[in-house]
Interface confidence: medium
């Protein structure tokens, strides 16, 4: 009764520069098989809840499980397989014909950056020719999910997007985040950021790619209309961006409450919780309604601002109306006004 | 650091039913998913029951609609509740908590085992 939660399971994640995502590939007695992400009785285009995946990413030395879902683009190899049964069961599987398969895709977090990174993989700067435009988004090593430097690729050619500041590309943008699966534009990232600057131990060949584009209509609806090909610029800005869907979020939790659903807002960064201070941005329930969601407890009764005489008490501060807009916190090393929240309690 | 323990073990007549709990401690927070595992004498660990943080489930074939996982994330504990119990459950029953680490890692953390007889 094979399940990926087994200690002999083997698993892969192929087509992408990093072992840490991409088409999750399993070995079953015969050999190496695309999994369909038909399988289990989903339809091709249902994501997961990504925690249920927790032991391959653990297996492939990779962090936290980030998103379970469909793969962007589907590679079909000889084999694909259909499974039946539990999510992440492979007991009972079977042979699918390769036009009816989209791939199975997992994104784990990158595990913590300890060795120069290897040079990028064949796969991921020169696709088969016949592949469709795809884009990718390259974050920096341990960096987040749907934040990063855009690529574009078509055909064998792939490569970054130059981007001017005045450039009104909105709609572009959104329509990007949404190509990648991962949600809507919610602001340019400085390249920095976005970990585009050449890290010193880098190796000289991940160096930029050959290919620049150059934005061409910023109201395409599909890929291939998007960009025209530019000659590499030495210097100038390339577009990056952070989408909705960037992980991992800011998680909360309720702190010295009678119940899991009243308490002090607590946030964490890291491994670390500290208080979320007050903002003004935040004067409104949004922001606690989401906290409430986020504890499955029902919505906010009330919040209030705790005083804080303390000159010297800290906590973290987040500038957006809501935490899920949040993808940094600011640490507050004085005045740190705690809120206390109280949520209907769906088990009194 | 997270610990797991495990209580509800003992000895039941088949058809019977026990409750297992699993208490975790420390930085429960960090917990990711958590799972019941089982190992009968001469024989492999394997899957019983495991749950995610949103609260799905995956069960082992031969315990569906007999055991139920819970979860209760506030207070960090997992329960099994074993229902129709068969004497091939005879076992030692593990806790299993995935937990998140520094830069993301998981490590896994195991309780020491209860152990479930069912006598026929």
């Known amino acids: 009764r094979l399940s990926w939660y087994d200690p002999d399971f083997q698993a892969r994640l192929t087509r992408s520069n990093s072992k840490c995502q991409g088409q999750l590939e399993v070995y079953l007695k015969d050999g190496w098989h695309m999994v369909c992400s038909q399988s289990w009785g989903r339809s091709s285009k249902q994501w997961e809840d990504p925690s249920q995946a927790s032991k391959v990413c653990q297996r492939l030395n990779c962090g936290v499980p980030l998103s379970l879902g469909p793969f962007l683009v589907t590679y079909t190899p000889q084999s694909s397989i259909i499974c039946y049964g539990q999510l992440g069961s492979f007991s009972n599987c079977s042979h699918s014909r390769n036009d009816m398969c989209h791939s199975l895709g997992l994104t784990c977090l990158e595990p913590q950056k300890t060795t120069p990174p290897t040079t990028r993989p064949p796969p991921t700067t020169t696709p088969e020719p016949t592949a469709p435009p795809r884009l990718q988004l390259v974050a920096q090593s341990g960096g987040q999910h749907c934040a990063g430097v855009v690529e574009f690729y078509s055909g064998s050619l792939g490569g970054t997007i130059s981007y001017e500041a005045q450039d009104k590309t909105q709609d572009l943008e959104n329509f990007l985040c949404n190509n990648l699966q991962c949600g809507s534009f919610l602001k340019h990232l400085p390249e920095t950021e976005a970990g585009r600057a050449q890290d010193p131990g880098e190796p000289r060949e991940h160096q930029p790619l050959p290919i620049q584009w150059k934005i061409q209509n910023s109201s395409c609806t599909s890929l291939e209309h998007c960009f025209r090909k530019i000659k590499p610029q030495k210097s100038g800005r390339v577009l990056a961006l952070l989408c909705s869907g960037f992980q991992p979020k800011v998680q909360s939790r309720l702190v010295g409450g009678s119940s899991i659903c009243e308490g002090t807002v607590e946030v964490r960064q890291g491994a670390q919780w500290a208080a979320l201070c007050d903002s003004s941005s935040a004067r409104s329930s949004l922001r606690w309604e989401e906290v409430c969601r986020e504890q499955q407890c029902g919505s906010v009764n009330s919040y209030r601002v705790l005083d804080a005489g303390d000159p010297t008490s800290r906590g973290l501060f987040c500038p957006h109306q809501k935490l899920s807009q949040c993808h940094e916190l600011w640490e507050r090393n004085s005045y740190c006004k705690k809120v206390f929240v109280t949520c209907q309690d769906p088990n009194p | 650091e997270v610990q797991v323990v495990e209580s509800g073990g003992g000895l039941v007549q088949a058809g019977g039913s026990l409750r297992l709990s699993c208490a975790a401690s420390?930085?429960?927070?960090?917990?990711?998913?958590m799972g019941w595992y089982r190992q009968a004498p001469g024989k492999e660990r394997e899957v019983v029951a495991a749950i995610s943080n949103g609260g799905n489930t995956y069960y082992e074939d031969s315990v569906m609609g007999r055991f139920t996982i819970s979860r209760d994330n506030a207070k960090g504990t997992l329960y099994l509740q074993m229902n129709g119990l068969k004497p091939e459950d005879t076992a030692v029953y593990y806790c299993n908590a995935d937990t998140v680490v520094g830069g993301g890692l998981l490590t896994e953390v195991w309780g020491q085992g209860t152990l479930v007889t069912v006598s026929s």
């Open positions: 420390g930085s429960i927070f960090s917990i990711n998913a």
